[in-house]
Interface confidence: medium
């Protein structure tokens, strides 16, 4: 089955620059299928823009200005690229790639979509670092004692743009856990968001990860915030014992035996 | 030109109570097009639900039913037993892939219908209230309450800033909420909640403990061997950007 990944959840540009949006095709050979690009402007219907067929033929929707969009595909990386030239305010939209997933029986074809890339146009000069800054909250003793469950909370602040994806996993598992989140909120020129995960008592002794996808993450990869395993009694954290082998190492919250 | 028009912009549904979305075609016969339904959830993910005839996306067949009313030129999508997972924007779209008439393999979309999910009517439930702290940050966690109306107050004399609470449906079909704030005196912050004409305090849930309750790290986590607790994630979180937590009793 065909699967589409759009690695950029957002792409921030200043006016008149060029935006390049990527779509990675897996589960199907890109040179044996057509890739379609759609646009969803705020408050408007999702609209077909352009497609590139298995033989490289490009088809544009009528009414789309020529020279605005360029579509390409690179079989070696199984990637289709939509290039938007000379970006302007009316290009602000979420752009989706899509393909028809062939099935055996007549009519049994479905069009699957990538997760979308939001094109953001800004005239602001922002701080050098507008990646999400995490703060973690561990379960309260009262909750673990009374409810035999614990809630982890992952707060992300001072990021731009507002497009962010957060999910949770146990340390050695790829299963995405059911979590809950607040709306993304504006704070001055940046944004904040929080997500929380409630786990049963039996899972509290497992390490959990809050995984954050954002355009301005360092090196363009997902940021993982580690929540250490805990026991269902009083937990004492000592900031002096954080584990940081070098400036590139991950966050660690070390459990220590500090009594009152 | 054809146009797909949803019956409603927003449809509130209750958990477990069947709901129907309708989408009418203007300017052409709906029988000349394949109708598709998609759901867009938080984070823009567009998931395929249904396509004529009897084609369902993974996990949708048991809880969704797509149909066409030719006489009324309508596409219909029934959500048989809505759950909180079904919240999102629903789109109808059409194409004529592989069929007679004007061949088009592009999808023509209608505007979305926003489906909001509410818990079904149930006996009133008092919340549990817990406070979580880290540095100047305080979170008030309010769990498993019904109905939705609630006021959450973080009680402090030295407020820096507060944020609007997030109120969501809990997996059990009640509500959960979290309110965040920043305070200079975070250690003394408590949370009080007004719900159903009653006040509930976080202090009501505090557990009395003495030092014998404190737990050593697990045997495998020796504080002198930090490497055992360090993990290389896909990306690095710089420790200077992280508010480390200190809970002492």
């Amino acid at each position: 089955a065909g699967h589409l990944e759009q690695p950029q959840i957002s792409s921030t540009k200043t006016l008149s620059k060029t935006a390049r949006l990527e779509c990675v095709v897996s589960g199907i050979t890109i040179s044996a299928t057509s890739v379609y690009w759609y646009r969803e402007r705020p408050g408007e219907v999702i609209q077909f823009l352009v497609s590139i067929s298995y033989d490289g033929t490009v088809r544009k929707e009528s009414g789309i200005p020529s020279g605005k969009f360029e579509v390409d595909r690179i079989p070696e990386t199984s990637t289709s690229t939509l290039t938007i030239h000379n970006v302007e305010k009316q290009d602000i939209a979420t752009y989706y790639c899509a393909l028809w997933e062939a099935q055996q029986e007549l009519g049994k074809k479905i069009k699957v979509f990538g997760p979308g890339t939001k094109l953001i146009i800004t005239d602001k000069q922002l701080d050098a670092d507008v990646s999400p800054k995490p703060t973690i909250f561990l379960p309260s003793i009262a909750e673990t004692k009374l409810q035999k469950a614990g809630t982890y909370l992952c707060l992300l602040e001072k990021f731009f743009p507002d497009v962010i994806k957060i999910h949770w996993q146990e340390k050695k598992s790829n299963t995405i856990l059911g979590s809950q989140e607040g709306n993304t909120m504006k704070t001055n020129d940046t944004y904040m968001k929080f997500s929380w995960l409630t786990v049963p008592e039996k899972s509290l002794d497992k390490e959990h990860r809050c995984i954050v996808r954002h355009e301005n993450n360092k090196n363009g990869v997902d940021q993982e915030i580690i929540f250490p395993p805990i026991k269902t009694d009083v937990i004492t954290m000592d900031p002096k014992d954080n584990c940081s082998k070098d400036a590139n190492d991950t966050l660690l919250l070390q459990l220590t035996n500090t009594s009152a | 030109a054809i146009e797909l028009v949803p019956e409603h912009q927003t449809v509130p549904v209750s958990i477990g109570v069947p709901a129907t979305l309708r989408c009418s075609m203007k300017g052409e016969a709906i029988g000349n097009y394949y109708i598709n339904w998609y759901r867009k959830t938080q984070g823009n993910t567009m998931t395929f639900i249904y396509r004529e005839k009897d084609i369902y996306g993974p996990g949708f067949k048991d809880n969704f039913q797509g149909d066409i009313d030719i006489a009324k030129n309508l596409a219909v999508l029934k959500i048989l037993a809505p759950s909180e997972r079904d919240e999102g924007s629903y789109y109808c779209a059409c194409d004529t892939l592989g069929m007679g008439g004007e061949y088009t393999d592009k999808l023509i979309f209608g505007k979305g219908t926003r489906v909001t999910v509410e818990p079904r009517s149930q006996p009133h439930t008092k919340p549990s209230v817990f406070v979580m702290k880290n540095g100047t940050n305080v979170a008030c966690l309010v769990k498993e309450f019904y109905p939705k109306d609630i006021r959450i107050n973080l009680v402090s004399s030295k407020k820096i800033t507060e944020f609007d609470p997030a109120i969501v449906i809990s997996p059990s079909g009640k509500y959960n909420a979290v309110k965040l704030g920043k305070y200079e005196d975070s250690n003394s912050v408590t949370c009080s909640v007004q719900h159903d004409n009653k006040t509930v305090h976080s202090t009501d849930f505090e557990v009395k403990t003495d030092s014998t309750d404190h737990v050593k790290p697990k045997e495998t986590e020796n504080t002198k061997q930090p490497s055992k607790s360090c993990h290389k994630p896909k990306a690095i979180v710089h420790t200077e950007k992280v508010n480390m937590m200190s809970l002492t009793v």
Partner: antibody, heavy 119, light 110 residues
């Protein structure tokens, strides 16, 4: 209960125009396609054409030059005109309902009108 | 000559099974849905199968339809004397932009 009631002359002279009407009773014409199908004695079915509520039509290419269909939604009826008839047009003419290219099947039929072309 | 090809006749004893084939091309059966009709002499045709294999309400499950490639098949099990009739297949032809029928098959119960 929806029914299709056919009306029109059973005898038409060669070179003249055959005219038939089909009235939808028990429901509105709705957004269906309304079709005409004929069957010469002892032979198979032949699709003549269809008309949509809006008035758009599709005709069998072999009859296209002689066929005209119309719809009157206010009267809940649709009509067939076949010009320059010959003896080869003698057949039972049926009106029938279908739902479009993806619903090209006839779930409701009129009883049929035998039209004889003879001088 | 019909665009879709059916055998002129098939027969079987009561209680037996008959199958009727209907062959076409990629522009009709190959890319569109097939329907089947029963016509008792002197009456209008009646829809038996639509969308290749679906039965309208009131049609018994001993009537079945299938499609493979550019051919379709109608099956009737537990043959009864009341099944004696002419049977027609039909579909849309994308090249002609027209509806097409088979020439019809007469079913005889021996």
């Amino acid at each position: 209960q929806v029914q299709l009631v056919q009306s029109g002359p059973g005898l038409v002279k060669p070179s003249e125009t055959l005219s038939l009407t089909c009235t939808v009773s028990g429901d509105s014409i709705g957004h269906y396609y309304w079709n005409w199908i004929r069957q010469p004695a002892g032979k198979g079915l032949e699709w003549i054409g269809r008309i949509y509520t809006s008035g758009s039509t599709n005709y069998n290419p072999s009859l296209k030059s002689r066929v005209t269909m119309s719809v009157d939604t206010s009267k809940n009826q649709f009509s067939l005109k076949l010009s320059s008839v010959t003896a080869a047009d003698t057949a039972v003419y049926y009106c029938a309902r279908s739902g479009g290219n993806f619903y090209w099947y006839f779930d409701l039929w009129g009883r049929g009108t035998l039209v004889t072309v003879s001088s | 000559q019909s665009v879709l090809t059916q055998p002129p006749s098939v027969s079987a004893a009561p209680g037996q099974k008959v199958t009727i084939s209907c062959s076409g091309s990629s522009s009709n059966i190959g890319n569109n849905y097939v329907s089947w009709y029963q016509q008792v002499p002197g009456t209008a045709p009646k829809l038996l199968i639509y969308d290749n294999n679906k039965r309208p309400s009131g049609i018994p499950d001993r009537i079945s339809g299938s499609k493979s490639g550019t051919s379709a098949t109608l099956g009737i099990t537990g043959l009864q004397t009341g099944d004696e009739a002419d049977y027609y297949c039909g579909t849309w032809d994308s090249s002609l932009s027209a509806g097409v029928f088979g020439g019809g098959t007469k079913v005889t119960v021996l």
